[in-house]
């Protein structure tokens, strides 16, 4: 090894990564909200729709104050990976009725991937435990019908909206702790 020499700064640091994650999450939340509204306009939902393979909501108002950095980032990454796979599945399995939303679903998937990359980079830089990416609990088979894929889309977008809403709050809170 040669004499001590400094390294140039890399493009970002963990705090900047967290800022970036917050911005990406907010942007994704707006996209999801808009897409969910489009879905409701085109295919009015008859009540709430659920999908067994979707993750349960990670946070609630009561737990927000006791959040820990590792737990939040790990859970958020696992949940978002599950939503990413569900959006992928929706794009593949969607019938003709959902094809009109293909550009929006494609953009949503790309933004989800960017957010997942950013969260992983943040976890690597902080040296937090890297969770094994979560496979959907239920193998995702083709929807039973065209209406089945519409109900699945309602459930996926609704769940993602709630997850991202809590993610923004959680990440903003974590910013004060890093």
């Amino acid at each position: 090894p040669g004499p001590p020499a400094g390294s140039p700064r890399v493009s970002s640091d963990p705090r900047a990564d967290l800022d970036s994650a917050v911005l990406l999450t907010r942007s994704l939340l707006a996209d999801t909200r808009q897409l969910a509204a489009q879905m409701r306009d085109k295919f009015p939902a008859d009540g709430d729709h659920n999908l067994d393979s979707l993750p349960t909501l990670a946070m609630s108002a009561g737990t927000l104050g006791s959040l820990q950095l590792p737990g939040v980032l790990t859970r958020l990454r696992v949940d978002l990976m599950s939503y990413f796979r569900h959006v992928q599945w929706l794009r593949r399995a969607a019938g003709p009725s959902l094809k009109t939303l293909e550009p929006e679903l494609g953009a949503l998937q790309a933004r989800l991937e960017r957010l997942l990359r950013r969260l992983q980079l943040l976890m690597s830089r902080l040296a937090l435990p890297q969770a094994a990416p979560d496979q959907p609990a239920v193998p995702l088979g083709p929807p039973a019908s065209a209406w089945g894929s519409i109900r699945a889309a309602h459930a996926i977008l609704g769940g993602l909206h709630l997850t991202l809403d809590w993610a923004v709050r959680g990440l903003l809170l974590l910013k004060t702790r890093l």
Partner: antibody
Framework: EVQLLESGGGLVQPGGSLRLSCAAS????????GHWVRQAPGKGLEWVAL????????YYADSVKGRFTISRDNSKNTLYLQMNSLRAEDTAVYYC???????WGQGTLVTVSS | QSVLTQPPSASGTPGQRVTISCSGS?????????VHWYQQLPGTAPKLLIY???ERPSGVPDRFSGSKSGTSASLAISGLRSEDEADYYC???????????FGGGTKLTVL
């Protein structure tokens, strides 16, 4: 400018101990995980140990588990590696690194020989 | 033997494009974990070259690019220059080992 400066290397007999230190400057050390990575003469890089930004998580390569201990003092911007029960195969240049790792020190040579 | 597999050597002439591969498994590269690339010039410490599969730190020329697909990743260097002669290492987190792993390194020779 970011700097990581290792110290504490040297010649030690098999079964002996050494403590490596790494002084960080030029960046917010307390926001980064800290690594030790080694490179035996003429060989490739081998990850040794990793500690989270706040010291709450520690990870070790199987080859050093139970013999090496990683620690950090964020108030001193310093990373440590306590090496016990040293073996000839631990002979290497030991690099301190931070982040992904994004930043690397220049390394300190540890020679284990009788 | 390294967990990530790289060719021991690669070569090219100035101006050429060379690619270095890095093959992993379902517990590292294939598990959605990011791949990072390092350059180690002779007699110096490693330097981060590519992070998060395809992002370049500031100061790294755009001649260097990374990509990832399935359980493999690759580093491409276009417009090869004599100063690119170095050892190149890939790295990724390995879930089964609970830690980062490095490839064995590829020695790049500029002919």
């Amino acid at each position: 400018e970011v700097q990581l400066l290792e110290s504490g290397g040297g010649l030690v007999q098999p079964g002996g101990s050494l403590r490596l230190s790494c002084a960080a400057s030029g960046f917010t050390f307390s926001s980064y995980g800290g690594h030790w990575v080694r490179q035996a003469p003429g060989k490739g890089l081998e990850w040794v140990a990793l500690i989270s930004y706040d010291g709450s998580y520690k990870y070790y390569a199987d080859s050093v588990k139970g013999r090496f201990t990683i620690s950090r003092d964020n108030s001193k911007n310093t990373l440590y590696l306590q090496m016990n029960s040293l073996r000839a195969e631990d002979t290497a240049v030991y690099y301190c690194a931070a982040g992904v790792p994004d930043y690397w020190g220049q390394g300190t040579l540890v020679t284990v020989s009788s | 033997q390294s967990v990530l597999t790289q060719p021991p050597s690669a070569s090219g002439t100035p101006g050429q494009r060379v690619t270095i591969s890095c093959s992993g498994s379902s517990s590292n590269i294939g598990s959605d974990y990011d791949v990072h690339w390092y350059q180690q010039l002779p007699g110096t410490a490693p330097k981060l070259l590519i992070y998060s599969n395809n992002e370049r730190p500031s100061g790294v020329p755009d001649r260097f690019s990374g990509s990832k697909s399935g359980t493999s990743a690759s580093l491409a260097i276009s417009g090869l220059r004599s100063e690119d002669e170095a050892d190149y290492y890939c790295a990724a987190w390995d879930f089964s080992l609970s830690g980062p792993v490095f490839g064995g390194g590829t020695k790049l020779t500029v002919l």
